[in-house]
């Protein structure tokens, strides 16, 4: 069935959430395989995902070494089967990815409300400090550990009986808000990095309402 040419990868796209980072590309290979290389601007090109027929490569282990660095990846197309290499002088075809700076670009994952506790007319709402795959001294860092005060949370809260939302902000993982006595409230939070120009906000957390399991109610 005749020879075909190797095809360069295209649509190289970084998919990254809370630093879990995967490079995706097209096309699905026919009689070819791919090897990915990743580098910082000043570093060596390191091969990963050798001779794969996948069209994605998990590069998390590389980018978490320094999330503030800017990375570039490239995808090589290698003939595998009844094909001819179209690279010059036996050099394989490759395509470069866009640059990627994890600290500035990784998507913020959907946060989770860990708990809420009412004491009189005050409610303390705690956001789960999600673990990332970034390591320091052999332990995984949380989102707060990585972003510090660059990361804030916005709390949306409203009376169960009405639709009017109020907001609060914190640069920790806790909110302390005033509520009306005898009213049940619902809560949702969103992670935000105000200094960013892209991917500034996460999706909203699942809604949690008072009178359900997560909360604790104490009338003082």
């Amino acid at each position: 069935s005749g020879t075909t040419n190797t095809v360069a990868a295209y649509n190289l796209t970084w998919k990254s959430t809370n630093f879990k980072t995967i490079l995706e590309w097209e096309p699905k290979p026919v009689n070819q395989v791919y090897t990915v290389q990743i580098s910082t601007k000043s570093g060596d090109w390191k091969s990963k995902c050798f001779y794969t027929t996948d069209t994605e490569c998990d590069l998390t282990d590389e980018i978490v070494k320094d999330v503030k660095q800017t990375y570039l990846a490239r995808v090589f197309s290698y003939p595998a089967g009844n094909v001819e290499s179209t690279g010059s002088a036996g050099e394989p075809l490759y395509e470069n990815s866009p640059e990627f700076t994890p600290y500035l670009e990784t998507n913020l994952g959907q946060p989770t409300i860990q708990s809420f506790e009412q004491v009189g007319t005050k409610v303390n709402v705690t956001v789960e400090d999600e673990r990332t795959l970034v390591r320091r001294n052999n332990t995984f860092l949380s989102l707060r550990d990585v972003f510090g005060k660059d990361l804030i949370y916005t709390l949306y809260y409203w009376k169960s009986s009405s639709s009017g939302k109020k907001t609060a902000k914190t640069n920790t993982n806790e909110f302390l808000i005033d509520v009306d006595k005898g009213e049940n409230y619902c809560f949702s939070v969103q992670a935000v990095i105000p200094s960013r120009t892209v991917n500034r906000k996460s999706t909203d957390s699942p809604v949690e309402c008072m009178g359900q399991e997560k909360g604790e109610f104490r009338e003082i």
């Epitope: 290979p29 395989v33 090897t35 570093g43 060596d44 090109w45 390191k46 091969s47 050798f50 001779y51 794969t52 027929t53 070494k65 090589f76 290698y78 003939p79 595998a80 089967g81 009844n82 094909v83 290499s85 036996g90 394989p92």
Partner: antibody, heavy 117, light 106 residues
Framework: EVQLVQSGAEVKKPGESLKISCKGS????????MNWVKQMPGKGLEWMGM????????RLNQKFKDKATLSVDKSISTAYLQWSSLKASDTAMYYC??????????WGQGTTVTVSS | EIVLTQSPATLSLSPGERATLSCSAS?????MNWYQQKPGQSPRIWIY???NLASGVPARFSGSGSGTDFTLTISSLEPEDFAVYYC?????????FGGGTKVEIK
């Protein structure tokens, strides 16, 4: 010119330790994974694993996980294969080979290791 | 791990004859290399990516196959072709070699 030069033949007793070397020259040593391949006398080839010199990440064949250790010294462009306690079954020719695509193919000349009491 | 089985273990042929070497994988492989090794020498890449001839390899050699069955063919043996040939898969870790086929002079 790319060259991989391996250390000389070794004769050891069971239980002894050993470190053999593979020095790369003529290319950016830290940019290429380095493979190690074992060949027992009169037998076939076995892929032991490979190491990336820039950060020492290793991919090891589980068969050799508790038997051999891969390391590098970037400052002298040298990869190492070592054993803490040799066995008779470690008697073999050991090759280092730069991980390359396609026609690029660079192997060391091999190091003969003989383990005998 | 993927086990590669080469057959026959030894192939006794005369110069000018056709040689067919087989490599069978225990599960599907997408990237297969073949190496040639002569006595006292390091292995040399011979065919890469299933069917691509390495630099300097004569056109009488060819490689083919897909999935679990791969073949190295020498259309007409020359004296310098007598050697051991190994297949190697690089589709999944650990990378593995076949046991080799020795092509010897009959």
């Amino acid at each position: 010119e790319v060259q991989l030069v391996q250390s000389g033949a070794e004769v050891k007793k069971p239980g002894e330790s050993l470190k053999i070397s593979c020095k790369g020259s003529g290319y950016s040593f830290t940019s290429y994974w380095m493979n190690w391949v074992k060949q027992m006398p009169g037998k076939g080839l076995e892929w032991m694993g490979m190491i990336y010199p820039a950060d020492s990440e290793t991919r090891l064949n589980q068969k050799f996980k508790d038997k051999a250790t891969l390391s590098v010294d970037k400052s002298i462009s040298t990869a190492y294969l070592q054993w803490s306690s040799l066995k008779a079954s470690d008697t073999a020719m050991y090759y280092c080979a730069r991980e390359d695509y396609g026609s690029s193919d660079y192997w060391g000349q091999g190091t003969t290791v003989t383990v005998s009491s | 791990e993927i086990v590669l089985t080469q057959s026959p273990a030894t192939l006794s042929l005369s110069p000018g004859e056709r040689a067919t070497l087989s490599c069978s994988a225990s599960s599907s492989v997408s990237y297969m290399n073949w190496y040639q090794q002569k006595p006292g020498q390091s292995p040399r890449i011979w065919i890469y990516g299933i069917s691509n001839l390495a630099s300097g390899v004569p056109a009488r050699f060819s490689g083919s196959g897909s999935g679990t069955d791969f073949t190295l063919t020498i259309s007409s043996l020359e004296p310098e072709d007598f050697a051991v040939y190994y297949c190697q898969q690089k589709s999944s870790f650990p990378w593995t070699f076949g046991g080799g086929t020795k092509v010897e002079i009959k």
